[in-house]
Structures are given as structure tokens and as C-alpha cells.
């Protein structure tokens, strides 16, 4: 579809005569008839196959024709066509004298013709005008012509239809050859596909408009290149969505179980060595001079009452020193210079001579001990605290400080390790002598049933149209990440199919 345009510029008829030679009275009131037709080697009369157009009276005898409207007619003259331009044509231009106002052919005398020109040739579609001048014995006509395409038609023959658009079906303008030229930010055959934010991850991100980056399920970040870990993941990371890969020292499905209590909490005091012994469990090995579960108690070396025979103990930096009472000597005042005659036995103890009176021995009443019955019985000496409990003298009584996992007056009762419900995911807990054991339900394993071993919901490849499948660990179901242009729980529905789609 296009338009053949003819621009009349100047007509010369100096003598004001008709083709017959007869003069016009009072002058030749001139109008034109134009016939455009298919190429003929010899232009002959017949149908104007490409169209006809007539002008009003444009002037008398000789005159120049103005560029736009002249006397109600249009210049250039328009001859539209609704077919592929063939590239060749024939053109007939007739100049006529109008004695009256009726310009219809049947209303004019046959000798009213002033002049007639006929040309033919090749003409390519283009913006440039071809200038021509035709001269007869009495007249001269100067004119130019061209062929241009109608709006929305393009190409060498005006045969390519292209209508610019900026809507759901495309975002483009048309090139001179009729090909689409996508607007900035759009791509694809019909410029329907937005160009996402630069760097937006090809699989994990998408966009519905240019320079956007929307994340598919399981991904986050400006460019959708960061996976979202499993919901509730505390001390873990992911490399694919919904994972929870535990950081060093953490365990469990949500990486919230502390496997390195020593590093994370430093419970051992006074330079003690800490050893991890299970989840939230540890053992402190104390340096000399310290005691307690966390080695928080400073040991006095005099606490063990090393001085005998009523000797008094003094703490020193590198140990202790015994101050012996009269009649005793030695590191622990263990040697005596006394005999029974000196009444060396205290607290009602009875004295017995030994080695012909050179030595003696005291027989002590209950609750007293020592070589001179000088010490009250230490209730801790018999090691009454079971299971590694620490005995503490508290005046007339004693007390056991129990290790984790034990209780009772003498630490004789084993605290149930199962009381804390350590088995995850409904595992059954069994108390053992040295700890506990979890029996895990189907789909879980690990010391505490913290490792999920369930069937991969993506194993059956449920996602269609090259969608990516992820397993949602919390529900054992799959999630399909649809590529651009597809929707549905399994990406089964194409959003749109081009008219040329092969049904």
C-alpha cells in the first residue's frame, strides 16, 4: 500500500490555444486530468489500472502551480494504491480548457483538450522527487513525481506491514525496511521480552518490565543470586534454596544445636582445658590448684589437713608448710618426741606405749582421728560422692557437688539424658549407661535424628517446560521455578503463543 505523488509546477501556453490550434476565449482556463496505469511499452488508451485524479482550474494560459492547495485541489496530487508497487508504471497527463464550471468529461466539448503527454518507465519507492519537463509545439509542462509507502507500510515495494506499538503484544518501532526495532529495554522476536536489570541471574531471576529483577522462589538479593536458606536455619548457609549447611561447630536440621560449646561459650575458668563431649556438653580439665565443674574454685593445699598431731597449716605459693606443736617434728609433724607420760592423746583418746616406751599410739574415740586424736573425722575422706562427684566439707556436714548428668545426695542418681527431649523429628530416646541413643522415624537419621533422608520430591521431574525443581524440606513437597512465559504449579501453562505457533 502506498501513494504515487505528482507535483505540477509550471504550465506554459503562451498563445492561449487549444490542441486544435483554435484560441480559447477569453483565455485557456486550464485544469488537468491524470491517469496512472501499469507499464505499457506503448502507452495506449484504456483503464487507468492504478488510479485517476483531476484538478480544479489551476490558471489561465501560462502559470506556476503552488505547492499545497490550489483552488481547492491538492498539489502534489495523490494517487493511492492498495497493492505491492511493481516498480514500473505508465502516466498520462492531459491539460483541458474549462469554458464553464462543470469539469466532468461529458460536459466538455471534445476539442477542449489543450495538450496530452504520456510517459512510462521504472520508479523505485523513495522520498526523492524525479523532475521532468514535457514540451509540445505549443505548450510546456514542468512537473515532478515519486512513490512513497502509506503509513505502517515499508520495504522496496511497500508490501511489509509494520505498526509501531508499546503494549503487552510488543514494544517496538519500525525500521525503513519494515523490520522491528525494539524499544530500549525490550528484546525477542516481537520485542515482548523485557531486558532485566543488568546482572540479574538468568535462571533465578526474571522481570515483567525492563531493568527489573524479580526473584523466583528460594532466591533473594538485588540480582537474585543469593539463595534463601531453610526457614529457621540459625547457624548455616545454602548453595541452593532451602538448604541449611551448618557452620563449623553447629548441628541439627536448623543448625541450632551447639556442637562446640567450648569455643562458643568458653565455660572453663582459670586456664582449664575444655573438651566438647556432645551437644551443649563439655568437660573442664583443671590446672593444679583448681577444682569445680568449670574449675572455678581455687583449691587450698591446706584443705586436705596434711599437718598431723595438731600442727597448723600455712598456704604458700609453692605448696604449704606445717607449724608443729611442742614435741613433734617432720614435714607433716608426723614424728613425736613424746611418750604416754606426756598425755599426748587429745579428745579422750587413750595412749598405748610402743617400742619399750620409745613411742606411743593413740586409740581415738568415734568422730576423731589423727595420730593424737586431734582431728575431727573428715567426712570426705571416705569418698562418699559417686560418679565423680566432688565432696565439700560444710562444718558438721558434707555435701556432694555432682557432675552434669547426675543428682542425689551422693550423686548416685543418673539424670535421664532423655529428659531434655534431645531426639529431633519425633525420634524415640533411650537412656544408656554412658549417654543416650535415638531411634529415628522413617526419613531421618543422625545421632539426634537431625539429618533428613526423605525421598526427594523432585526425583519424579514434576516441573514442565525446563522449569527448575526445588524440594521444600519443611513439607517434603516440590516447588517449580517457571522460566519466562510460563505459569502453573508445574509451569504447565504457556502465557502466550505467537500467531505462527505450530498447532
Amino acid at each position: 500500500s502506498g501513494v504515487f505523488q505528482l507535483q505540477l509546477q509550471e504550465f506554459i501556453n503562451e498563445r492561449g490555444v487549444l490542441a486544435s490550434g483554435r484560441p480559447c476565449e477569453p483565455g485557456c482556463r486550464t485544469f488537468f486530468r491524470v491517469c496512472l496505469k501499469h507499464f505499457q511499452a506503448v502507452v495506449s488508451p484504456g483503464p487507468c489500472t492504478f488510479g485517476t485524479v483531476s484538478t480544479p482550474v489551476l490558471g489561465t494560459n501560462s502559470f506556476a502551480v503552488r505547492d499545497d492547495s490550489s483552488g481547492g485541489g491538492r498539489n502534489p496530487l495523490q494517487l493511492p494504491f492498495n497493492f505491492t508497487w511493481p516498480g514500473t508504471f505508465s502516466l498520462i497527463i492531459e491539460a483541458w480548457h474549462a469554458p464553464g464550471d462543470d469539469l466532468r468529461p461529458e460536459a466538455l466539448p471534445p476539442d477542449a483538450l489543450i495538450s496530452k503527454i504520456a510517459i512510462q518507465g521504472s520508479l523505485a519507492v523513495g522520498q526523492n522527487w524525479l523532475l521532468d519537463e514535457q514540451t509540445s509545439t505549443l505548450t510546456r509542462l514542468r512537473y515532478s513525481y515519486r512513490v512513497i509507502c502509506s503509513d505502517n507500510y515499508y520495504g522496496d515495494n511497500c508490501s511489509r506491514l509494520c505498526k509501531k506499538r508499546n503494549d503487552h503484544f510488543g514494544h517496538y518501532v519500525c525500521q525503513p525496511d519494515g523490520n522491528l526495532s525494539c524499544l530500549p529495554g525490550w528484546t525477542g522476536e516481537y520485542c515482548q521480552q523485557p531486558i532485566c536489570l543488568s546482572g540479574c541471574h538468568e535462571q533465578n531471576g526474571y522481570c515483567s518490565k525492563p531493568a527489573e529483577c524479580l526473584c523466583r522462589p528460594g532466591w533473594q538479593g538485588r540480582l537474585c543470586n543469593e539463595c534463601i536458606p531453610h526457614n529457621g536455619c540459625r547457624h548455616g548457609t545454602c548453595s541452593t534454596p532451602w538448604q541449611c549447611t551448618c557452620d563449623e561447630g553447629w548441628g541439627g536440621l536448623f543448625c541450632d544445636q551447639d556442637l562446640n560449646y567450648c569455643t562458643h561459650h568458653s565455660p572453663c575458668k582459670n586456664g582449664a582445658t575444655c573438651s566438647n563431649s556432645g551437644q551443649r556438653s563439655y568437660t573442664c580439665t583443671c590446672r593444679p590448684g583448681y577444682t569445680g565443674v568449670d574449675c572455678e574454685l581455687e583449691l587450698s593445699e591446706c584443705d586436705s589437713n596434711p599437718c598431723r598431731n595438731g600442727g597448723s597449716c600455712k598456704d604458700q605459693e609453692d605448696g604449704y608448710h606445717c607449724l608443729c606443736p611442742p614435741g613433734y617434728y617432720g614435714l607433716h609433724c608426723e614424728h613425736s618426741t613424746l611418750s604416754c607420760a606426756d598425755s599426748p592423746c587429745f579428745n579422750g583418746g587413750s595412749c598405748r606405749e610402743r617400742n619399750q616406751g620409745a613411742n606411743y599410739a593413740c586409740e581415738c574415740p568415734p568422730n576423731f582421728t589423727g595420730s593424737n586424736c586431734e582431728k575431727k573425722v573428715d567426712r570426705c575422706t571416705s569418698n562418699p560422692c559417686a560418679n565423680g562427684g566432688q565432696c565439700l566439707n560444710r562444718g558438721p556436714s558434707r555435701m556432694c557437688r555432682c557432675r552434669p548428668g547426675f543428682t542425689g545426695t551422693y550423686c548416685e542418681l543418673h539424670v535421664s539424658d532423655c529428659a531434655r527431649n534431645p531426639c529431633a523429628h519425633g525420634g524415640t530416646c533411650h537412656d544408656l549407661e554412658n549417654g543416650l541413643m535415638c531411634t529415628c522415624p522413617a526419613g531421618f537419621s543422625g545421632r539426634r535424628c537431625e539429618v533428613r533422608t526423605s525421598i526427594d520430591a523432585c526425583a519424579s521431574s514434576p516441573c514442565f517446560n525446563r522449569a527448575t525443581c526445588y524440594t521444600d524440606l519443611s513439607t517434603d513437597t516440590f516447588v517449580c521455578n517457571c522460566p519466562y512465559g510460563f505459569v502453573g504449579s508445574r509451569c504447565e501453562f504457556p502465557v502466550g503463543l505467537p500467531p505462527s505457533f505450530p498447532w
Epitope: F464, N465, G488, S489, R490, E492, F493
Partner: nanobody, 117 residues
Framework: EVQLVESGGGLVQAEGSLRLSCAAS????????MAWYRQAPGKQRELVAG???????HYAESVKGRFTISRDDAKNTVSLQMNSLKPEDAAVYYC???????????WGQGTQVTVSS
């Protein structure tokens, strides 16, 4: 493969209503995902509404709030209730089914919907 037959198309005034129905053959109809597409002359075929395998529904932005898709597995039918119709809704409407294992789609022959203003 299921055979699909659409019905219910016709001429309706703008702002009027129409109900399209699609009858499917086959005893495993309930396992298929179903959808309605439409195609106007010279335009691409586009998704109007769909019921996914898990029962979730999907609608084109242009029909949200006006069209409702539903299925009756006992009668092997899927329907599209169209309210507040606009001239731009005029098109040939096609029923579409998706096989649950292969993902292959089947089309009906289509039913014409004309909306006069």
C-alpha cells in the same frame, strides 16, 4: 489423549455475561491441568485462566475479577464464567488440557465469542 469440545460461545452486549463450557473425554480427567486460551485475529494465542495440578488458579491480568474458572471432575467439565465483558474480550476461546506425566497439551476446536458495543 483427552478429546475436548467447547460450547457456550456467541454474541453478547458489552458489560454482559457468558459461560463457556468444555467437555472432556477420558476417565483420568481429574488428574489433568485445564485452562482457557483465546486468540483474536492476527494476535497471539494467550492464556485467559487455568486450574493447575494442585488446584491453584491463574488469571491473565486483563480478566482478573471478571472471569472465574472452575472444574467439575464428576462431569469431566471445565467452565469459564465471563462477566462484565468488553469489546476487547472478543476472540475464539480454546479449551486446553495438560497431561500430568508428560506435560503435553491438547486443544479443543474453539468457540467464538463476539462482544458488541
Amino acid at each position: 489423549e483427552v478429546q475436548l469440545v467447547e460450547s457456550g460461545g456467541g454474541l453478547v452486549q458489552a458489560e454482559g455475561s457468558l459461560r463457556l463450557s468444555c467437555a472432556a473425554s477420558g476417565s483420568t480427567f481429574s488428574t489433568y491441568a485445564m485452562a482457557w486460551y483465546r486468540q483474536a485475529p492476527g494476535k497471539q494465542r494467550e492464556l485467559v485462566a487455568g486450574i493447575s495440578f494442585d488446584g491453584s488458579t491463574h488469571y491473565a491480568e486483563s480478566v482478573k475479577g471478571r472471569f472465574t474458572i472452575s472444574r467439575d471432575d464428576a462431569k469431566n467439565t471445565v467452565s469459564l464464567q465471563m462477566n462484565s465483558l468488553k469489546p476487547e474480550d472478543a476472540a475464539v476461546y480454546y479449551c486446553y488440557s495438560v497431561h500430568p506425566s508428560t506435560g503435553f497439551g491438547s486443544w479443543g476446536q474453539g468457540t467464538q465469542v463476539t462482544v458488541s458495543s
